[in-house]
């Protein structure tokens, strides 16, 4: 628990941290550990995530062994007449859990974003809103005719695939790969997932990649030409380095991003490709992550409903009004 003894680290390589969780040196400067998150217990050995402005709050000095990861006090967030303090979490609706961090709100979907592949017992899976339920659920439709139609439109159209055809049969295995899910963030670094059984054991596995639809700093609405409603693919600015949990990409990238619309449409990636990106961390650790790179974007009305201000803001307006 404390740093008085010699450094002793597990023999196996550094742990794999969940998405968005930083890999940091423990408080003793000995071993690499997954940083503790907001509200989790922390010790001298198990530090809080410094890249999220978290510190280990021990309470009274008499009990300086175990603390709770607490957000640094910062600017509040003000919505609908309610003032949320920095570090405070609140539910904007049954679908979103939001956190105020130094004046800015970040929201996570509470509804599962899982994907369901067609199977013999459920050849036509479809997500529907059931009465009295908050989140959409999967139902199995009987085919209306014999034409095989795939799962509902995903946010990304064409992934440049290298390798087997997504529906080829290989050694008693019907190889199936879903389309990549929409990026978990409408701006900044997020995660996109898909499900595939394209592996030696024909087992379903979840693959993930980093994605950035657009940087958060860009005020893209200002670049829309007079009379136009959308800016589909803004001009590529200077080459940038990507950041992930305090680590920086080793190369610079002249990446394409998607723009925004002012007429209620969503602007999302249309054609993408996946490439490995190497990140170098302050402690010298190098990690390689797959990342989505955008080729083209599309503007469309295939957006979630407007029944939730955060949902419509996140997916439809991006940075839109709540007025």
């Amino acid at each position: 628990q404390n740093c008085s003894g010699p450094c002793r680290c597990p023999d196996e390589p550094a742990p794999r941290c969940p998405a968005g969780v930083s890999l940091v040196l423990d408080g003793c400067g000995c071993c690499r550990v997954c940083a503790k998150q907001l509200g989790e217990l922390c010790t001298e050995r198990d530090p809080c995530d410094p890249h999220k402005g978290l510190f280990c709050h021990f309470g009274s000095p008499a009990n300086r062994k175990i603390g709770v990861c607490t957000a640094k006090d910062g600017a509040p967030c003000i919505f609908g007449g309610t003032v949320y303090r920095s570090g405070e979490s609140f539910q904007s609706s049954c679908k979103y859990q939001c956190t105020c961090l130094d004046g800015a709100v970040g929201c996570m979907p509470l509804c599962s974003m899982d994907v369901r592949l067609p199977s013999p017992d459920c050849p036509f899976p479809r997500r529907v809103k059931l009465p009295g339920k908050c989140c959409e659920e999967w139902v199995c439709d009987e085919p209306k005719d014999q034409t095989v139609v795939g799962p509902a439109l995903a946010a990304y159209r064409l992934e440049d695939t290298f390798g087997p055809d997504p529906t080829m049969i290989r050694a008693n295995c019907l190889v199936q790969t879903t389309e990549w899910s929409a990026c978990s963030k409408t701006c900044g670094m997020g995660i996109s997932t898909r499900v595939t059984n394209d592996n030696a054991s024909c087992r379903l596995e979840k693959q993930s990649r980093l994605c950035m639809v657009r940087p958060c700093e860009a005020d893209l609405e200002e670049n829309i030409k007079k009379g136009k409603k959308c800016i589909r693919t803004p001009k590529i600015s200077k080459p940038i380095k990507f950041e992930l949990s305090g680590c920086t990409s080793m190369k610079t990238y002249r990446a394409k991003f998607c723009g925004v619309c002012t007429d209620g449409r969503c602007c999302t990636p249309h054609r993408t490709t996946t490439l490995p990106v190497e990140f170098k961390c302050p402690d010298g650790e190098v990690m390689k992550k797959n990342m989505m790179f955008i080729k083209t974007c599309a503007c469309h009305y295939n957006c979630p409903g407007d029944n939730d201000i955060f949902e419509s803001l996140y997916y439809r307006k991006m940075y839109g009004d709540m007025a």
């Epitope: 890249h51 999220k52 402005g53 510190f55 709050h57 607490t70 640094k72 006090d73 910062g74 600017a75 509040p76 967030c77 003000i78 919505f79 609908g80 007449g81 309610t82 003032v83 303090r85 920095s86 961090l101 130094d102 004046g103 800015a104 709100v105 970040g106 929201c107 963030k185 701006c187 900044g188 670094m189 997020g190 940087p215 958060c216 700093e217 005020d219 609405e221 200002e222 950041e243 803001l313 996140y314 940075y319 839109g320 009004d321 709540m322 007025a323």
Partner: antibody, heavy 126, light 105 residues
């Protein structure tokens, strides 16, 4: 380029009210908070309050509670700060300052008052 | 909540200078620093303890731990002569220090 342009100097009598405006340009007005900060002659900075220009929600410093009202007009990208029951110690330069973007993923926000207006001098004198 | 700064600090051109700001458990809060030249509006130079907005020279850096936040200017230039204010949030209210007048000799 991002600009905040404030209204001109005001001279008021004690007990009166003053309404200062701050017109924003060069960015999406409803996407960023706006703060009001004042500075008495030869003194330091004093935070008065904050407004969310999107929904119009506000939060004021306790010292100014009941005396200050912050509003906004999204059609003109303008925020207003009205201070009532003026006294001589309210003589100061009043600044509007753009705050954090309302929504952004952790680590990608510029959290601070990053753009300031030129200031409006309010003199309270009988 | 009170933030305490030294009223004045002086430095020779090219030297490194540090301006401190102390407050109860300040290390548990985000600290920002603002520069204000005479007759001008304030400029944000450091936010979230250590971050520098674009356009602010690399010679400006910040740190914050314990009860003290520090603004450090390395290779100080004549144009850095100004008042510097630290700022932090407590109970949803922003507080500024009284300011430090930096003189470049």
């Amino acid at each position: 380029e991002v600009h905040l342009v404030e209204s001109g100097a005001e001279v008021k009598k004690p007990g009166a009210s003053v309404k200062v405006s701050c017109k924003a340009s060069g960015y999406t007005f409803t996407s960023y908070y706006m703060h009001w900060v004042r500075q008495a002659p030869g003194q330091g900075l004093e935070w008065m309050g904050i407004i969310n220009p999107s929904g119009g929600s506000t939060s004021y410093a306790q010292k100014f509670q009941g005396r200050v009202t912050m509003t906004r007009d999204t059609s003109t990208s303008t925020v207003y700060m009205e201070l009532s029951s003026l006294r001589s110690e309210d003589t100061a330069v009043y600044y509007c300052a753009r705050g954090t973007r309302l929504y952004c993923s952790g680590g990608s926000c510029l959290n601070g008052m990053d753009v300031w207006g030129q200031g409006t001098t309010v003199t309270v004198s009988s | 909540y009170v933030l305490t700064q030294p009223p004045s600090v002086s430095v020779s051109p090219g030297q490194t200078v540090s301006i401190t700001c102390s407050g109860d458990k300040l290390g548990n809060k985000y600290a920002s620093w603002y520069q204000q030249r005479p007759g001008q509006s304030p400029i944000l130079v450091i936010y979230q303890d250590t971050k520098r907005p674009s356009g602010i020279p690399e010679r400006f850096s910040g740190s914050n731990s314990g009860n003290t936040a520090t603004l450090t200017i390395s290779g100080t230039q004549a144009m850095d002569e100004a008042d510097y204010y630290c700022q932090a949030w407590d109970s949803n209210t922003a507080f500024f220090g009284a300011g430090t007048q930096l003189t470049v000799l």
